[in-house]
């Protein structure tokens, strides 16, 4: 089982849409696949896929989940809020027939506020 996640870095404006993709590949067929998205280590959702369908379509606040055969799991955040900023990780495990798990690399999501004055904490600082 292998999981490839993208993009590595995603910068979007508040109120727009963000799409995170997780490619889950397994050399042999599987009956049930457990998938999980986390943000900053906290679980957003943990549905499973069987018979080509997701057991859950919602994933965290304003998050929609979709599965496109043969291997694409997509998390769509719409509309994006400042709270969506963080580090997202996709994890997958074949539960049937044999337990095997893998996780992707981090996708870092940065959300730019509509109001630039809210962005003070993002001002670059340089060493003296």
């Amino acid at each position: 089982l292998s999981v490839q996640q993208g993009p590595n870095l995603l910068q979007v404006r508040q109120g727009s849409q963000a799409t995170l993709v997780c490619q889950v590949d397994q050399a042999t067929a599987w009956e049930r696949l457990r998938v999980k998205w986390t943000k900053d280590g906290a679980i957003l959702c943990q549905p499973y896929i069987t018979n080509g369908s997701l057991s859950l379509g919602v994933c965290g606040p304003q998050g929609r989940l979709s599965w496109q055969a043969p291997s694409h799991l997509t998390l769509q955040l719409d509309p994006v809020s400042l709270n969506h900023s963080g580090a997202y990780v996709c994890w997958a495990a074949v539960e049937i027939p044999e337990l095997e798990e893998a996780e992707g690399n981090i996708t870092r999501l940065f959300v730019d506020p509509d109001d630039p004055t809210q962005n003070r904490n993002r001002i670059a600082s340089f060493p003296g």
């Epitope: 050399a27 042999t28 067929a29 599987w30 018979n51 055969a69 043969p70």
Partner: antibody
């Protein structure tokens, strides 16, 4: 371009352990998402999957051989190996190493094969 | 274990004529989760290692001549050669990749009449 090359003794005595090595060139054996396999072909017969090992070290063996088979990887040498214990004349075959990727469920690169005869 | 049954075992063909090989599996090789059939076709030319021709039942590997085609779904699969050439001689094997253990058909020997 990935290339595989089998090596090992061409003659093994009954009850001993058959040991073969597959050297991988043009590709890192520790790359995520890849499996490294052994397949054999008895003289004039069809193909038999022995087993494979994945990039994480997980092994999958043919149940008909499982009690006698060990597949392992040496990442420092970019090699993987096959050990088959307690061999008999029925283990006489051409042994192939092959590779496949998680995202493509097929063996896309094969070694040229090495003939192993079990005889006293 | 999934049993793969190939027919015919021997196939004499005149160059330029079509050829067809059947492969039946003892259980379905289709997955609704991935929308794929886990069935591959290989050609082993005399004295060589097998080479992949077709994967996922119908996808031709890059570089394989378009006279080779694969079809079928579930348990019933076919490899067709539209016009056989002398270089097509060898043993053809179907193989499932649905689950472990992976198994191959017994092979079909294609020979030129």
């Amino acid at each position: 371009q990935v290339q595989l090359q089998e090596s090992g003794p061409g003659l093994v005595k009954p009850s001993q352990t058959l040991s073969l090595t597959c050297t991988v060139s043009g590709f890192s054996i520790s790359t995520s998402g890849y499996y490294w396999s052994w397949i054999r072909q008895h003289p004039g017969k069809g193909l038999e999957w022995i087993g494979y090992i994945n990039y994480g070290g997980g092994t999958y063996y043919n149940p008909s051989l499982k009690s006698r088979v060990t597949i392992s990887v040496d990442t420092s040498k970019n090699q993987f190996s096959l050990k088959l214990s307690s061999v008999t004349a029925a283990d006489t075959a051409v042994y192939y190493c092959a590779t496949m990727a998680d995202r493509f469920a097929f063996f896309d690169v094969w070694g040229q094969g090495t003939m192993v005869t079990v005889s006293s | 274990d999934i049993v793969m049954t190939q027919s015919p075992l021997s196939l004499p063909v005149t160059p330029g004529e079509p050829a067809s090989i059947s492969c039946l599996s003892s259980q379905s090789l289709f997955s609704s989760n991935t929308n794929r059939n886990y069935l591959n076709w290989y050609l082993q030319k005399p004295g060589q290692s097998p080479k992949l021709l077709i994967y996922h039942a119908s996808t031709r590997l890059s570089g394989v001549p378009d006279r080779f085609s694969g079809s079928g779904s579930g348990t019933d699969f076919t490899l067709k050669i539209s016009r056989v050439e002398a270089e097509d001689v060898g043993d053809y094997y179907c193989q499932h990749h649905y689950e472990t253990p992976l198994t191959f058909g017994d092979g079909t020997k294609l020979e030129i009449k």
